[in-house]
Amino acid sequence: EVEKTACPSGKKAREIDESLIFYKKWELEACVDAALLATQMDRVNAIPFTYEQLDVLKHKLDELYPQGYPESVIQHLGYLFLKMSPEDIRKWNVTSLETLKALLEVNKGHEMSPQVATLIDRFVKGRGQLDKDTLDTLTAFYPGYLCSLSPEELSSVPPSSIWAVRPQDLDTCDPRQLDVLYPKARLAFQNMNGSEYFVKIQSFLGGAPTEDLKALSQQNVSMDLATFMKLRTDAVLPLTVAEVQKLLGPHVEGLKAEERHRPVRDWILRQRQDDLDTLGLGLQGGIPNGYLVLDLSMQEALS
């Protein structure tokens, strides 16, 4: 082991205070006791240490806790958290939501770093599921958090947690993720009345099957075009012109502007032209009158 430089006379730190910001790196290494640092971690964040000095303090904690820091230290890491690697964080056992909040606060306003992703992963795995309080906290700091999870990870979200989800939290979710979230949302909001239910379920409808869209069309919901355009193409195709008209209500006029885009384009191709004409929107591309529509999927099922 390399021989350590001795602490100069009179410089031994009796407490973690601002005098330490004037210590050179080797003096911090030699004069600050790691155990003292661990018990007074809450002071470190209030003292304007340089990044180089924080490196020294981290090294001292690493030596004291080679198996990973205890939560009492983790909770007060403050800016020192930014010095941690994902490997460091994988050694931690973080169980308190307050600890999680304190560390997320340090990274606030920045993209989710690998450190934060690892921290959240450790925390959620430790809890066993994404409960409502955790989800509330995570989406408050990272609105796109939910959409960063795999469908498998989303399956651990209990329906009760869905109440914490805001529409913007789902902005970057793909259909596979909404397929998992939609049934949970449907379950969570099942006791609400029609209009209230639609307001809550609307952002999740990208995962809705045809039969649920048909049911919604009977409830005068007036779905806006933005929501309609996010619906699964395979769920929209079987809808009749009458059902789409009821589903969209006054917003049906917007179909004209979207006739070249999915799912509207694909849906038009499946409708009889004379049915489309009843909308009076000038939609073109439907099945000409007199043509027979064969449902090949049904034919395959019979053979």
Epitope: G10, K11, D17, E18, S19, I21, F22, A46, I47, P48
Partner: antibody
Framework: EVQLLESGGGLVQPGGSLRLSCAAS????????MSWVRQAPGKGLEWVSG????????YYADSVRGRFTVSRDNSKNTLYLQMNSLRAEDTAVYYC?????????WGQGTLVTVSS | QSVLTQPPSASGTPGQRVTISCTGS????????VSWYQQLPGTAPKLLIY???KRPSGVPDRFSGSKSGTSASLAISGLRSEDEADYYC???????????FGGGTKVTVL
């Protein structure tokens, strides 16, 4: 017990000079940054200057920069404030204080009056 | 005009709780620790709270400090007649490269 004792205040004419001293005891003076803070009669506190343990960087309020100079002698456990080109608005009680980011100990202050 | 903003006065009856606010910006309170100082009439200031919420030894636990974003506050619970004094908040300002104080709050015990 930490003690800070200022001296050197008094009456001086506008444009004149004065040197304040602060004798420190009860702590390892050479380990700590030191500061000067002043308070005009009936007014609030105003930070004047700060100096780290090794005198490396010196910090000044805009209102005194270029006129005041802070220094220290670690062998004598003493902090100084050299004040030149004094103005009427420099009239105040001048306190020396331990540290630069949070003043945990203060002297009793010395009154500087700038008047003709 | 002080860089940190405090109400000029606050008052309460004995036993009451009084709170003093201190508002700054991202370059001072937002990124540095806040301290609170008590100045009794005719005496030098005394450190009451440091590092946002810590009390030096000898300061009663009736005094508490907190910080959130670019604001800080000092709370005095169980107000006593001897708490009648001027209270100042202070913080280092990274843009000015200097220490800044609030204008002070005179606390009166009714």
């Amino acid at each position: 017990e930490v003690q800070l004792l200022e001296s050197g205040g008094g009456l001086v004419q506008p444009g004149g000079s004065l040197r304040l001293s602060c004798a420190a005891s009860g702590f390892t003076f050479s380990n700590y940054a030191m500061s000067w803070v002043r308070q005009a009669p009936g007014k609030g506190l105003e930070w004047v200057s700060g100096i780290p343990p090794d005198s490396g960087s010196k910090y000044y309020a805009d209102s005194v920069r270029g006129r005041f100079t802070v220094s220290r002698d670690n062998s004598k456990n003493t902090l100084y404030l050299q004040m030149n080109s004094l103005r009427a608005e420099d009239t105040a009680v001048y306190y020396c204080a331990k540290n630069m980011f949070s003043f945990d100990y203060w002297g009793q202050g010395t009154l500087v009056t700038v008047s003709s | 005009q002080s860089v940190l903003t405090q109400p000029p006065s606050a008052s309460g009856t004995p036993g009451q709780r009084v709170t003093i606010s201190c508002t700054g910006s991202s370059s001072n309170i937002g990124s540095n620790a806040v301290s609170w100082y008590q100045q009794l009439p005719g005496t030098a200031p005394k450190l009451l709270i440091y590092y946002n919420s810590k009390r030096p030894s000898g300061v009663p636990d009736r005094f508490s400090g907190s910080k959130s974003g670019t604001s800080a506050s000092l709370a005095i619970s169980g107000l006593r007649s001897e708490d009648e004094a001027d209270y100042y908040c202070g913080s280092w300002d990274s843009s000015l490269n200097g220490y800044v104080f609030g204008g002070g709050t005179k606390v009166t015990v009714l």
